[in-house]
Interface confidence: low
């Protein structure tokens, strides 16, 4: 299709070479063609709007995502060529950041539903440059933390360096929903809720004597509660002693909660006493159970093919620690009688 | 819109599955909760599910309920119901991200589940 | 968890005249409250989110306020259509996504 005719918006995208980082392009679509696909939604906050930012369409899935090669060739089809792009709705979500990104980016309806609908489509001309080392320092980061129940704020990493006063306005979006209040460089939240997680996208307009462009970035916000001030508790085996029948299977579980570290390197480990020996026990790798805000509960076995006489002399011991410190569980096999 | 079905009579015991189909926007981009009310009483919540996060429980129904989704539909499956689960269930949308918090609106009519033997 | 306790269970007022129902969370929860109107035989409607914020098409005789862990919802100048149970609901989810609901208060005009 002709793509003369699609609106032209410039982005920027200026990444760290130190840290991981994602972009994403909108398919931003223009306000003056008021068809089923080209409009935005005028909502109140009672009625959000029901798609990513400024979709009139029914069905997001109904958008088609190609980039133009520049040697002139036709038009590729992104979910055909980019293993590193991925087309959610009407987003374009890039995983790794590299210069090889740059390009044209076109996005349009893929049903054409009237003749006005022709030239319903976006150019992104996409430039991608490393971060250089006379940039700011201390630019924030593209992974914020804010903790649960207190005051925080989310800086655009691209702005992160200046002043509030000499800051340009911003639009940002939280998962990919304009937050039309904030205009700030910063967001600040009161009081930090489990819902404030989420992908924050921050936009600003830079200008030379020629042209125009945005300047985006993108921040996930993860909500964290403090580190925790406890060592892990072992929840399971409760008992110290365990009737076994002899010749039989066992399988001895042992279960600890870790309190949220933002750091975390847990350990949980099986090891066996035998009069004056030690001995670690290399049982099936430990898994998580259950994550929450808070805490996180992890699972690790002890499997005896069958329980020998020898096994009721021994002491199995379960071994669990954090930052904070350890906490250990031992358990002595009896002989279940009758 | 949003709209329930699948209310009945139905034994104790023997599992039943009421569906929410949704209409003008996607469950792509929405969180799709479940509340009954029991004949006379007031509004109790059970859950929602959503693309990212999956189902979440309101701790007295975990265990009692499943929700789960298709690109249209939410379905509540009830897993062994009970006299006292005798309500009408709406599903409405939410919570989604609107002046920083959580809100259910639109509602459906309702589907309305008495338990009896 | 959180605890939302509503008063009065119920209020009868002339048309014309002004209700105030109050909702008591049991700990802080900011701001995160909702007001939901129910008709018999209806199912809710949003009226007020963030305490005092006006859902579209909810007319200005709604009023919502907070002072601290108190909540309160002022129906003025009473009409007919206000008869209607009205619901209290905190917004806010903790660990446990409980989202507890007030007891409701059943307003009656005459």
């Known amino acids: 299709f002709n793509i003369s005719g699609c609106s032209t918006k410039k982005l920027l995208w200026t990444y760290s070479t130190r840290s991981e980082e994602e972009f994403v392009l909108f398919c931003d679509l223009p306000e003056p063609q008021k068809s089923h696909f080209c409009h935005r939604n005028r909502l109140s906050p009672k009625q959000v709007p029901e798609h990513l930012p400024f979709m009139g369409s029914n069905d997001l899935s109904d958008v088609q995502w190609y980039q133009q090669p520049s040697n002139g060739d036709p038009l590729e089809d992104i979910r055909k060529s980019y293993p590193h792009i991925i087309q959610d709705k009407c987003t374009l979500h890039f995983l790794t950041p590299g210069v090889n990104n740059s390009g044209s980016y076109i996005c349009r309806p893929k049903m054409i539903k009237s003749p006005y609908d022709v030239a319903c489509c976006v150019k992104m001309i996409l430039e991608v440059k490393p971060q250089t080392n006379a940039s700011c320092e201390y630019s924030a980061s593209h992974k914020q933390d804010l903790l649960l129940g207190s005051t925080g704020s989310i800086s655009c990493p691209s702005l992160s360096c200046q002043s509030d006063a000499q800051s340009p306005a911003v639009t940002w979006y939280k998962n990919g929903k304009l937050l039309s209040v904030e205009r700030s460089n910063r967001i600040v939240v009161d009081e930090v809720y489990d819902y404030h997680q989420g992908t924050y996208v921050c936009d600003y307009t830079q200008s030379d004597t020629v042209s125009s462009w945005t300047v985006r970035a993108v921040v996930q916000v993860r909500t964290i509660v403090g580190d925790t001030k406890l060592k892990p508790d072992i929840l399971d085996p409760v008992e110290d002693t365990l009737e076994v029948e002899l010749g039989k299977p066992l399988t001895i579980s042992c279960k600890a909660r870790f309190g949220f570290e933002r750091v975390f390197n847990p350990v949980i480990k099986w090891y066996i006493k035998d009069s004056d020996l030690e001995w670690e026990v290399s049982v099936p790798e430990a898994k998580s159970i259950k994550s929450t805000l808070k805490d996180e509960i992890i699972e690790r076995n002890i499997i005896l093919e069958k329980v020998t006489q020898r096994d009721l002399r021994r002491k199995f011991v379960c071994f669990v620690q954090n930052s904070i410190g350890n906490t250990t569980q031992s358990v002595q096999l009896k002989e279940k009688r009758g | 819109s949003v709209e329930e079905s699948g209310g009945r009579l139905v034994a104790p015991g023997t599992p039943l599955t009421l569906t929410c189909t949704v209409s003008g926007f996607s469950l792509n981009n929405y969180a799709l909760s479940w509340v009954r009310q029991a004949p006379g009483k007031g509004l109790e919540y059970i859950g929602f599910?959503?693309?990212?996060?999956g189902a979440y429980y309101a701790s007295w129904a975990k265990g009692r309920f499943t929700i789960s989704k298709t690109s249209t539909t939410v379905d509540l499956k009830i897993t062994s119901p009970t006299t006292e689960d005798t309500a009408t269930y709406f599903c409405a949308r939410g919570p989604y991200y609107v002046g920083s918090e959580y809100v259910f609106d639109p509602w459906g009519p309702g589907t309305l589940v008495t338990v009896s033997s | 968890d959180v605890v939302m306790t509503q008063t009065p269970a119920s209020v009868s007022t002339a048309v014309g005249g002004t209700v105030t129902i109050k909702c008591q969370a049991s700990q802080s929860i900011g701001g995160s409250l909702a007001w939901y109107q129910q008709k018999p035989g209806q199912p809710p409607n949003l009226l007020i989110y963030s305490a005092s914020n006006l859902a579209s098409g909810v007319s200005s005789r709604f009023k919502g306020s907070r002072s601290g862990t108190e909540f309160t919802l002022t129906i003025s100048d009473l009409e007919c259509a206000d008869a209607a149970t009205y619901y209290c609901q905190c917004t806010y989810y903790d660990d446990s996504y409980d989202v507890p609901f007030g007891g409701g208060t059943e307003v009656v005009v005459k």
């Open positions: 599910i959503n693309i990212i996060h």
